[in-house]
């Protein structure tokens, strides 16, 4: 479905994205509702995800997400994280929306979701150094798995943006 076709009754809604990919939701009332993600974004549960192929600093990555009315990925469940991992390339690292601005090992998510130590996915021996204040998802061969790693925030990496699905 073209975005323009879906906006017949939503003329006041302004979005950055010119093309949406939508799924019809069965509603109890007669009017049709659509659940949409921007074209080339991945859809999972109630969110849309954009996996960048360009590298940038953590701050620039967050700005790039914001320009698309999104934010760097906030991981809420194991299922969400596993879905993301399936769509990443093993040789790259991807910034997420978790950082430690003061270097005090006080981690915070960009959307203010509380950081829960008991549901984290750090690689063994991570986080490694308070000078590394931003988090990437990366793959390790021993043991073979994806996980979290603290890195220099200025070092350019790929990133994952997240936004809520658009409902029309």
């Amino acid at each position: 479905q073209k975005y323009s076709q879906l906006l017949e009754k939503k003329t006041t809604k302004e979005l950055v994205h010119t093309t949406l990919e939508c799924v019809k939701k069965n509603m109890p009332v007669e009017e049709t509702a659509w659940s949409c993600c921007p074209k080339n974004w991945k859809s999972f549960s109630s969110n849309c995800y954009f996996i960048s192929t360009e590298s940038a600093s953590w701050q620039d990555s967050e700005k790039d997400c914001a320009r698309m009315e999104a934010h760097l990925l906030v991981i809420n469940t194991q299922e969400e994280q596993d879905f993301i991992f399936q769509n990443l390339q093993e040789e790259s690292a991807y910034f997420v929306g978790l950082s430690d601005p003061e270097g005090q090992r006080h981690w915070q998510w960009v959307d203010q979701t509380p950081y829960n130590e008991s549901s984290t996915f750090w690689h063994p021996r991570e986080p490694s150094d308070p000078n590394e204040r931003c988090v990437v998802l990366n793959f390790r061969k021993s043991p073979k798995r994806w996980g979290w790693n603290d890195v220099n925030c200025l070092g350019p990496q790929r990133s994952v943006c997240e936004m809520m699905k658009i409902h029309l």
Epitope: R105, R125, N131, N138, R140, K141, S142
Partner: antibody, heavy 117, light 111 residues
Amino acid sequence: EVQLQQSGTVLARPGASVNMSCKAAGYSFTSYWVYWVKQRPGQGLEWIGAIYPKNSRTSYNQKFQDKATLTAVTSASTAYMELSSLTNEDSAVYYCTRPHYDSFGYWGQGTLVTVSA
Amino acid sequence: DIVLTQSPASLAVSLGQRATISCRASESVDSYGISFMHWYQQKPGQPPKLLIYRASNQESGIPARFSGSGSRTDFTLTINPVEADDVATYYCQQSNEDPLTFGAGTKLEIK
């Protein structure tokens, strides 16, 4: 200045257990992992494992999984390593270290363990 | 496990000359653009001392005579010019994969 002060020389019998300590000073103890490294006389270096004092997470070299137990007491800024079921192969100098990025940036002076009947 | 092979096992260099020590890894120690290879110096009766971290970064307080280079599987520690105080054993170490591993060491002597 970062300092790691290790406990003194230990003489132990085969089959016994020993405990050694590593007292940290000059940095935030809970912000860094503490690593342990083994060096047998005249030989190379082996990584044993590491502990993150903030939440007591550990990471072991599988080779030492059943040999070493790592703990930490944050109130005393001290990390501990217990070695069990000692044999002659465990006679070595054991170092605690604090990472600099992912390298071993700061080292204790070492604890010599001698296993002898 | 990643095996680190150092060469030579020992070398003798004249004062003021260049010493070059090689460390070859059995597989790449690079991840997301960083080489997780480090170099240490150890003198008898002392703990090792960090010289170079992440392949080419000089630890603070280490003389500029010590430099590191390389990526993926091949790394080099260079001491130029060699001084009498450099007599020691030098180790490479990787931190890209568990378990962390060390090379067997290279003993540097003065000719």
